[in-house]
C-alpha cells in the first residue's frame, strides 16, 4: 500500500492555501464507491439530501458526482517550505446547486445547496492513492478525511503515525 502524503502539523497550512483560479481546471463526472466497492448514493428526503453507503443490486444505476478540480497553492510560510508546492483540490456535486460539505463540528459530510463562490467547507485536497484510489482531505481541517462510518460518510481524523492507507478513507472513481 502506498499513497497519502503525511498530514500532521498542517493545521493552518491548508486553511491558508489559496485556490489559484476561480474556474476549475477540469471537471469529471464519475460514480463514487468505497474501497470495498459499496456505492455512494444520494436520496432526496424531506426536501434535503441524504448520503448513503450501500451495496447496489445488480444492474442498479449508480449515482454520479461532478468533480471539479482546482489548482491550489500550498503555502510555504506555514509548512516551513521555501517551495510553494501546488496541489489539486476538488468539489463534489451530485446534483445541480448541491455540494458535499465538511461539517467539522459534527464530524459529518453533508449536502448543502449554495451559490458560487463556494465556501471552504466544500473543498477537499485530492490525494493520489495506491490501487487507483483517492482520498479527500478537508481544506478546513487538515488531517481530516472523508471516510465511511456505519454505512454513512463521515469525517475521520487520520494520525500520520498510524497506517495512512486505512481502507475507510479510500474511494474509487469510475465513469461507469
Amino acid at each position: 500500500a502506498f499513497g497519502i502524503s503525511g498530514v500532521q502539523k498542517y493545521t493552518r497550512a491548508l486553511h491558508d492555501s489559496s485556490i489559484t483560479g476561480i474556474s476549475p481546471i477540469t471537471e469529471y463526472l464519475a460514480s463514487l464507491s468505497t474501497y470495498n466497492d459499496q456505492s455512494i448514493t444520494f436520496a432526496l428526503e424531506d426536501e434535503s439530501y441524504e448520503i448513503y453507503v450501500e451495496d447496489l443490486k445488480k444492474d442498479e444505476k449508480k449515482d454520479k458526482v461532478l468533480l471539479s478540480y482546482y489548482e491550489s497553492q500550498h503555502p510555504s510560510n506555514e509548512s516551513g517550505d521555501g517551495v510553494d508546492g501546488k496541489m489539486l483540490m476538488v468539489t463534489l456535486s451530485p446534483t445541480k446547486d448541491f455540494w458535499l460539505h465538511a461539517n467539522n463540528k459534527e464530524h459529518s459530510v453533508e449536502l448543502h445547496k449554495c451559490e458560487k463562490p463556494l465556501p471552504d467547507q466544500a473543498f477537499f485536497v485530492l490525494h493520489n492513492m495506491h490501487s487507483n484510489c483517492v482520498s479527500f482531505e478537508c481544506k478546513t481541517d487538515p488531517g481530516v478525511f472523508i471516510g465511511v462510518k456505519d454505512n454513512h460518510l463521515a469525517l475521520i481524523k487520520v494520525d500520520s503515525s498510524e497506517n495512512l492507507c486505512t481502507e475507510n478513507i479510500l474511494f474509487k472513481l469510475s465513469e461507469t
Epitope: 502506498f2 502524503s5 503525511g6 500532521q8 509548512s79 521555501g82 496541489m87 489539486l88 500520520s160 492507507c165
Partner: antibody, heavy 119, light 111 residues
Framework: EVQLVESGGGLVQPGGSLRLSCAAS????????MSWVRQAPGKGLELVSA????????YYPDTVKGRFTISRDNSKNTLYLQMGSLRAEDMAVYYC????????????WGQGTTVTVSS | EIVLTQSPATLSLSPGERATLSCRAS??????????MNWFQQKPGQAPRLLIY???NQGSGIPARFSGSGSGTDFTLTISSLEPEDTAVYFC?????????FGQGTKVEIK
C-alpha cells in the same frame, strides 16, 4: 529554505554495501513521502525506493528488491538507503526526492551523491 | 510497469524558436479525469526541476514559455520561444501507478 542534502556515496566493490543518507531541512519532514531516484551515467532516471511519511509503507522495484532497504528517522529529519550486494549496474548518482502534498509529483530534489561500483 | 518513450532524442534549435517535445506512454496515464504526466528539466550537473504536473499545470515559478498538453498516451511539452538557459535534458514522468517511471529524456541544444 527547503533543502535535501545527500551523503554516503563513494567507491565500493561488487557485492559490497553502502548506506546513503539524506538530511532534510526547511520543511516538516515527517509530513511527506520521500523517494530515492537514481541516474546511471548518461542515462535516464529510475525510482529506486519510496517510503511513506511515517515509514510504515515502502516500495521497491524488482531490480533492487531484497538488496536495498529504505528507512527514515523523523526525529532526525533524515532519510536512508541501505544498499547491499551491489552490482555494476547500481553505479549511478542517487537523488533524494520529496513527494508533493497529495502525492502527484516530485517537488524537491537533493543535489545527488555518486555511487561507484568497481573492483 | 508503464514505459515512457520520448522523441526526438536530441533537438537543436536557435534562440527564439519553438521547441516541441513528445512523450508516449505504453498505456493510458489518465485516471479520474486527470492525466498523471509530469515534465522535468535537468541541466548539466544539477538535479531535475519540475516544469509541468498533471499534463498541463505549471510548477511554481516556471516561466510562461513552458506549457504542457495531451492526454491518454500522447503528451507534449512546448517551449514557445527558446532562451539560451533552456539548454537541458527534459524528462517526462508518470505518477498514475507505482513504480513512477520516467522517459529516457530529450536533449535540447541551443545553436
Amino acid at each position: 529554505e527547503v533543502q535535501l542534502v545527500e551523503s554516503g556515496g563513494g567507491l565500493v566493490q561488487p557485492g559490497g554495501s553502502l548506506r546513503l543518507s539524506c538530511a532534510a531541512s526547511g520543511f516538516t519532514f515527517s509530513s511527506y513521502y520521500m523517494s530515492w531516484v537514481r541516474q546511471a551515467p548518461g542515462k535516464g532516471l529510475e525510482l529506486v525506493s519510496a517510503i511513506s511519511s511515517s515509514g510504515g509503507s515502502t516500495y521497491y522495484p524488482d531490480t533492487v528488491k531484497g538488496r536495498f532497504t529504505i528507512s527514515r528517522d523523523n526525529s532526525k529529519n533524515t532519510l536512508y538507503l541501505q544498499m547491499g550486494s551491489l552490482r555494476a549496474e547500481d553505479m549511478a548518482v542517487y537523488y533524494c526526492a520529496r513527494h508533493s502534498y497529495g502525492n502527484w509529483y516530485f517537488d524537491v530534489w537533493g543535489q545527488g551523491t555518486t555511487v561507484t561500483v568497481s573492483s | 510497469e508503464i514505459v515512457l518513450t520520448q522523441s526526438p532524442a536530441t533537438l537543436s534549435l536557435s534562440p527564439g524558436e519553438r521547441a516541441t517535445l513528445s512523450c508516449r506512454a505504453s498505456e493510458s496515464v489518465d485516471n479520474y479525469g486527470i492525466s498523471f504526466m509530469n515534465w522535468f528539466q535537468q541541466k548539466p550537473g544539477q538535479a531535475p526541476r519540475l516544469l509541468i504536473y498533471a499534463a498541463s499545470n505549471q510548477g511554481s515559478g516556471i516561466p510562461a514559455r513552458f506549457s504542457g498538453s495531451g492526454s491518454g498516451t500522447d503528451f507534449t511539452l512546448t517551449i514557445s520561444s527558446l532562451e539560451p538557459e533552456d539548454t537541458a535534458v527534459y524528462f517526462c514522468q508518470q505518477s498514475k501507478e507505482v513504480p513512477w517511471t520516467f522517459g529516457q529524456g530529450t536533449k535540447v541544444e541551443i545553436k
